[in-house]
Every structure is written in C-alpha cells, then in structure tokens.
Amino acid sequence: TSSASSSSSSAPFLASAASAQPPLPDQCPALCECSEAARTVKCVNRNLTEVPTDLPLYVRNLFLTGNQLAVLPAGAFARRPPLAELAALNLSGSRLDEVRGGAFEHLPSLRQLDLSHNPLAYLSPFAFSGSNASISAPSPLVELILNHIVPPDDKRQNRSFEGMVAAALVAGRALQGLHLLELASNHFLYLPRDVLAQLPSLRYLDLSNNSLVSLTYVSFRNLTHLESLHLEDNALKVLHNGTLAELQGLPHVRVFLDNNPWVCDCHMADMVTWLKQTGVVQGKDRLTCAFPEKMRNRVLLELNSADLDCDPILPPSLQTS
C-alpha cells in the first residue's frame, strides 16, 4: 500500500485531463491512499476541489467522498490511457452542486456510482448518457445511488427537481441495464410518469423517505425483474386498484410500505382487501391508520368494509365556511 503524504502537495489539482501525462502504474495522487493489491484509491475528507488527474491505471474502486468538488465537468475522469478498470466510484458528500453532461464518459467498466449527499442544483440530462442523442450507447452502470441529492430550497432551479433527475435517468435510454436505483430522501412529491418505463432491468428501487402522496400515475408494469420496492416514510394515503394490480403482477417483488400515513376511509377498501391476500408486502401487519382520528393506530389488516366509511359530502347550500 502506498500513501501520498499531504506534505507533498497541498495545492488543488489543476492539471487538465487532456494534457495530463500518463500516470505511472504505481503512482498515488497527493492527498490520497492507494492499494494496488485491492485496486483501491481513497481520497477521503481532503477538501479536494478537483478530481486528481494522476489516478493510477489499476484503480477499480475510487472513493472521493467528503471533498469540495463543487462542479463535475464533462470528462472529469477521462484519461489517456483511460481508467479502463474503474468499476465503483463514490463521490458522496463532496459538496457537488453541478454535474455536467458527459461527466462519467470514458469509464467503460463503471458499474456503481454513488452521488449521495450532494446538493445537486444542476444535474445535466446527459450526466449518465454522455450525449444528447435520442438513443445513446448503453451505459455500463448497474447501480446508481442518488440518496439525498436535493439542494436546499434557495439553491433550487425554477424547474422541478423531480423533472431534472428524471431527465438524467431517461436520456438516450442509456440506463436500460440499471439493476439498482436509490432515490431516497429527496423530497420527491411525485415520480415523473415515464421514468420507470425506461429502466426495465431494475431489480431494486428505493424511493423511501420522500414526500410521495400518490402512485396513481406511476406504472410498475414493465419492471418484471423488480425484487425490492422501498416506499417507506412517504406521504402515501392509499394505493388504488391499478397500482395494486401492477404490484401483484410482478413475479418477484417485495414491497416495503412502513411509515406512510394511511387514510382509512371508504377509499381504502380495495387496498385492505388486497393486503389480506397478498404476499408482496413485507411487514404488512405493521401498516397502521393515521387518519381519520377515530381510526388512528388501527391495524389495516384488521379493518373490514363496515369500518371504512366516508363522510357524506354536503350539497353546496349546506356547506358552511
């Protein structure tokens, strides 16, 4: 294991990717720790402002967490010769607020990418596809981890954050081979309609700890390989028949629904019936009514149709302000 001491270079990395000399096979960038045996480079919590240019060619696992990268430009990891072995790239918690188109180009083996805990005010639609073609070359990515990438309110662009993330996921149909997608803790109010249709290979989808109120316009139908669907800690009130039928039709799926504020009124009847017979939902006997008040804390599985009523809607003449 070689380790570059911080005394060897305290200046930020400024050399451009294109002009960089080919790195020596066993070279380790300043402020990083390298293990050729483990094919791993760790440049962690070093306040780096740019991706090191002199990464060793053997690198398979690259940790660039806890830095101050701010912007990931096009070709941020492009090298001559390319980093052909790089398979896992972790950029979490590095204060990225902008990921530009083509940021991950020229990484032919990149299977896992973690951008979690970066306040991404701008995520290019071509961040993962690398080009603006309607159909791009397939990305090698198999796992994409985007937990807690929502920027603070004052840094948000005018367009919806959900839409920005969705555009990057569907661009060029590049992520058709993606197996795992984590989008937890992003304040999502909705899931854009066409996203899942473009990710047919998904096996694991984590949408937990968002603010999803409804899945009415989301289709899971073509996710035939889906094994785990995490919807815990959202704001779901009820699942309607269309969603229930789609979930039931997925051959391998397990669905996690804990910590949603279920509204146990007449609209809940179909979901209760489904819950009683499905094996899809994990920990289904923990699901508990939050509203209305008279139903609070009741177990959904123990409800029957007589319990599930809706207050009659008064005609306008009887309504009071």
């Epitope: 800690d233 910590n259 923990r286 508990t288 939050a290 609070r296 804390n297 009741r298 177990v299 123990e302």
Partner: antibody, heavy 116, light 107 residues
C-alpha cells in the same frame, strides 16, 4: 372508555421469572398493537417491545431480546410479558400501552421489585 | 436509529410564565409526539403529530417544529402543568424511541 388494567405490584427473587399481565377492555383487542415500556425509578421511558394480538407477531428492542417474551390471550383480551433471569436492574415500573404511531392509552403500570 | 435529546433536563416556571422545552432529533423526522407524566402516574399522550392536542388537553399547550427540531410550549404556566414531558418519534415500525424527558417544576 378504553382501559388497560395491570396489577399494582410484583415482588420476586433474583434469578426467578415473572409474568406481567395487561387486560384490555372497551375496544377491539386484535385491532391495535400492544407495547410494553420500562421505567426505572427517577428515569425515562424505555420501549421494550410490542405484539400484534391478532397474529402474535412481535418486535423487540435489541436490549430486551433475551429478557422479555411477549404473548397474548385473545379470548380474555390480555397481553402478557414474561421477564426471565431477574436481577436488581429489572426493578422498575412496567407499562403496557396501546399504540401504532403513538401510544394513545396506557395501563397504570406494574411495579416490579426484585429483592432477595 | 434516531436519538432524541430533550432540553433542558429540568426547568422551573412561575404561574403565568411562558414555558418552552425542546426535543432535538439526530436526523430529520416527520412528526413528533409529546407525553405528560405527573409524579406517581402513568404517561398520557399530550400532543401528537407535532401540533395536535389530545382531547382534554388545555389550549395553553402547543407543539411545533420540523426536521430535527421540535418544541412544546405552555403559554401560561399553571400548577397542574408541573410534570415530566417526553417526546417520542413518529413511527409505526420499531424501534419506538423516547427523549430523556424534561422535568417541569412550579416555582
């Protein structure tokens, strides 16, 4: 009015076991999870575990996994907690509480004293 | 696992005084509940879902907060409010966690 009735006191010797009871009335017993909470003298509240009276499913605080066993008798709408291998540290007030998102009704608590 | 920290641990207030106690979560939570426990009695749910008062709780009590910071306020302290108050995480799955409590005494 929902009620959870617990015996007032239990006195047991170190090393022994005890089975605390909590009898529920005036609601559908199987429709709500039942929780157990420990409170040592002048201390805070500590969640022990819970049980679904409908199917007997349980969850435990890791700390109490080898100490507490939760059961129910649906016919009498009674929840039980057995505490084993008692030590002086187990001396406390034990509450049952009906709950889901929160604990909306509590028993009066059973004061367990472990003394030789 | 989320840790709840209440402050202050002990406080005293004169009748008519405004009282505020806080509950800080180690990570963001959606809602918080509060329980009142008078000396020698079992706890009672006092405030739920951050700001809703349980039936029978006097209107001088209020709850507020979001994210990692929550508070319980008494607009005008009365003798019967002397008790220990516990916050509890909004959850329907284990584990259920309580704060360490704030003991409120009458001055």
């Amino acid at each position: 009015q929902v009620q959870l009735q617990q015996p007032g006191t239990e006195l047991v010797k170190p090393g022994a076991s005890v089975k605390l009871s909590c009898k529920a009335s005036d609601y559908t017993f199987t429709s709500y999870w039942m929780h157990w909470v420990k409170q040592r003298p002048e201390q805070g509240l500590e969640w022990i575990g819970n049980i679904n009276p409908s199917n007997g499913n349980t969850n435990y605080n890791e700390k109490f996994k080898n100490k507490a066993t939760l059961t129910v008798d649906k016919s009498s709408s009674t929840a039980y907690m057995q505490l084993s291998s008692l030590t002086f540290e187990d001396s406390a007030v034990y509450y049952c509480a009906r709950g889901g998102w929160d604990f909306d009704y509590w028993g009066q608590g059973t004061t367990l004293t472990v003394s030789s | 696992q989320v840790v709840l920290t209440q402050s202050p641990a002990i406080m005293s207030a004169s009748p008519g005084e405004k009282v505020t106690m806080t509950c800080s979560a180690s990570s963001s939570v959606r809602y918080m509940h509060w329980y009142q426990q008078r000396s020698g009695t079992s706890p009672k749910r006092w405030i739920y879902d951050t700001s809703k008062l349980t039936s029978g709780v006097p209107a001088r009590f209020s709850g507020s907060g979001s994210g990692t910071s929550y508070s319980l306020t008494i607009s005008s302290m009365e003798a019967e409010d002397a008790a220990t108050y516990y916050c509890q995480l909004w959850t329907s799955k284990p584990p259920w966690t309580f704060g360490g409590g704030t003991k409120l005494e009458i001055r």
